[in-house]
């Protein structure tokens, strides 16, 4: 790869490390769970295992009264915070893609089945536009099986 690309990747990585993408993850999960609610499915089956602070201590999240509040209160708050974070990547489409990939990876082991994964992916692709930002043209959101190691 070109040297300038590698240097850009390092700077992108620095931004990704500093970004708080939790509000994006929460906003999207609430969104797809609301959609499922309207089809009569309970998003809070015991297998759902929503985030707790102790599970993800490097992403302190002061905003959420309860994980993925199913009434949707606070979802617009999550979306606003999410958009503020994504705005940092507006002028670097490759880095925007990496931010979306990281959101996908962080949530991949919480998505129940292929259908929910596809729905999450679809909403994730639309996220930049929802924020009034340019969406990256080519962005592979497939999660490799090795990308699910979580501490």
């Amino acid at each position: 790869r070109q040297q300038w690309e590698l240097q850009g990747d390092r700077r992108c990585q620095s931004q990704l490390e500093r970004a708080n993408l939790r509000p994006c993850e929460q906003h999207l999960m609430q969104k797809i769970q609301r959609d499922e609610d309207s089809y009569g499915r309970d998003p809070y089956s015991p297998s759902q295992d929503p985030y707790s602070p102790s599970q993800d201590p490097d992403r302190r999240d002061p905003y959420s009264p309860s994980p993925y509040d199913r009434r949707g209160a606070g979802s617009s708050q999550h979306q606003e915070r999410c958009c503020n974070e994504l705005n940092e990547f507006e002028n670097n489409q490759r880095c925007m893609c990496e931010a979306l990939q990281q959101i996908m990876e962080n949530q991949s082991d919480r998505l129940q089945g292929r259908q929910q994964e596809q729905q999450f992916k679809r909403e994730l692709r639309n996220l930049p536009q929802q924020c009034g930002l340019r969406a990256p043209q080519r962005c592979d959101l497939e999660v490799e099986s090795g990308g699910r190691d979580r501490y």
Epitope: R10, R11, L16, E17, D58, D149, R150
Partner: antibody, heavy 115, light 113 residues
Framework: QVQLVQSGAEVKKPGASVKVSCRAS????????INWVRQATGQGLEWMGW????????GYAQKFQGRVTMTRDTSINTAYMELSSLTSEDSAVYYC????????WGQGTRVTVSS | DIVMTQSPDSLGVSLGERATISCKSS????????????IAWFQQKPGQPPKLLIY???ARESGVPDRFSGSGSGTEFTLTINSLQAEDVAVYYC?????????FGQGTKLDLR
């Protein structure tokens, strides 16, 4: 809370290799790069290179090219730095640091090279 | 490689006074795509690993007292410690992570006068 715990002190003979480990906890290991930095006694900080736990990609300072190898084992959230063909000049404290900007550091591993 | 040059090499400041450390980079470390300067400041006390104080030139790391501040852009940067405390005695390093190899300044030793 975030912790980086490094392996213990090492004494090596010239020409030998040393492998230092850095066990991470309290965060999503794959999301943050690991940097390795060394410091000889009474000297400043010297950046050696970086490694991405997610991809395994690495980048090394020219000075260490061909002599250093940075790897990771994501199943145990551990990064490794191996330095070969040691000389007395390599005697130093070796640090791992989390993140491109060095947000958190390990306690350091003293490596002494002596015949 | 980007060379980071700190000044002074050592500095003596009285308790409660202001300490100012300068760092110059041999080329700009401002990324125009996001308007961020990729420079950090570290504090190191004897026998301890370095501690991050400031990243992106002026963003204070969480838990760092607000008497520490960073400023500057492009090639010239400053770390300021207002109202110096006894526990601030240490060596301070600037660090660029704009391009590899990442590089540190030579360090500034801060002592009480």
């Amino acid at each position: 809370q975030v912790q980086l715990v490094q392996s213990g002190a090492e004494v090596k003979k010239p020409g030998a290799s040393v492998k230092v480990s850095c066990r991470a906890s309290g965060y999503i290991f794959r999301n943050f790069d690991i940097n390795w930095v060394r410091q000889a006694t009474g000297q400043g900080l010297e950046w050696m290179g970086w490694m991405s736990p997610k991809s395994g990609d690495t980048g090394y300072a020219q000075k260490f090219q061909g002599r250093v190898t940075m790897t990771r084992d994501t199943s145990i959230n551990t990064a490794y730095m191996e330095l070969s063909s040691l000389t007395s000049e390599d005697s130093a404290v070796y640090y791992c640091a989390r993140g491109v900007d060095g947000t958190n550091w390990g306690q350091g591993t003293r490596v002494t090279v002596s015949s | 490689d980007i060379v980071m040059t700190q000044s002074p090499d050592s500095l003596g400041v009285s308790l409660g006074e202001r300490a100012t450390i300068s760092c110059k980079s041999s080329q700009s470390i401002l990324d125009n795509s996001n308007n961020k300067n990729f420079i950090a400041w570290f504090q190191q006390k004897p026998g301890q690993p370095p501690k991050l104080l400031i990243y992106w030139a002026s963003a204070r790391e969480s838990g760092v007292p607000d008497r520490f501040s960073g400023s500057g852009s492009g090639t010239e940067f400053t770390l300021t410690i207002n109202s110096l405390q006894a526990e601030d005695v240490a060596v301070y390093y600037c660090y660029q992570y704009y391009s590899t190899p990442h590089t540190f300044g030579q360090g500034t030793k801060l002592d009480l006068r």
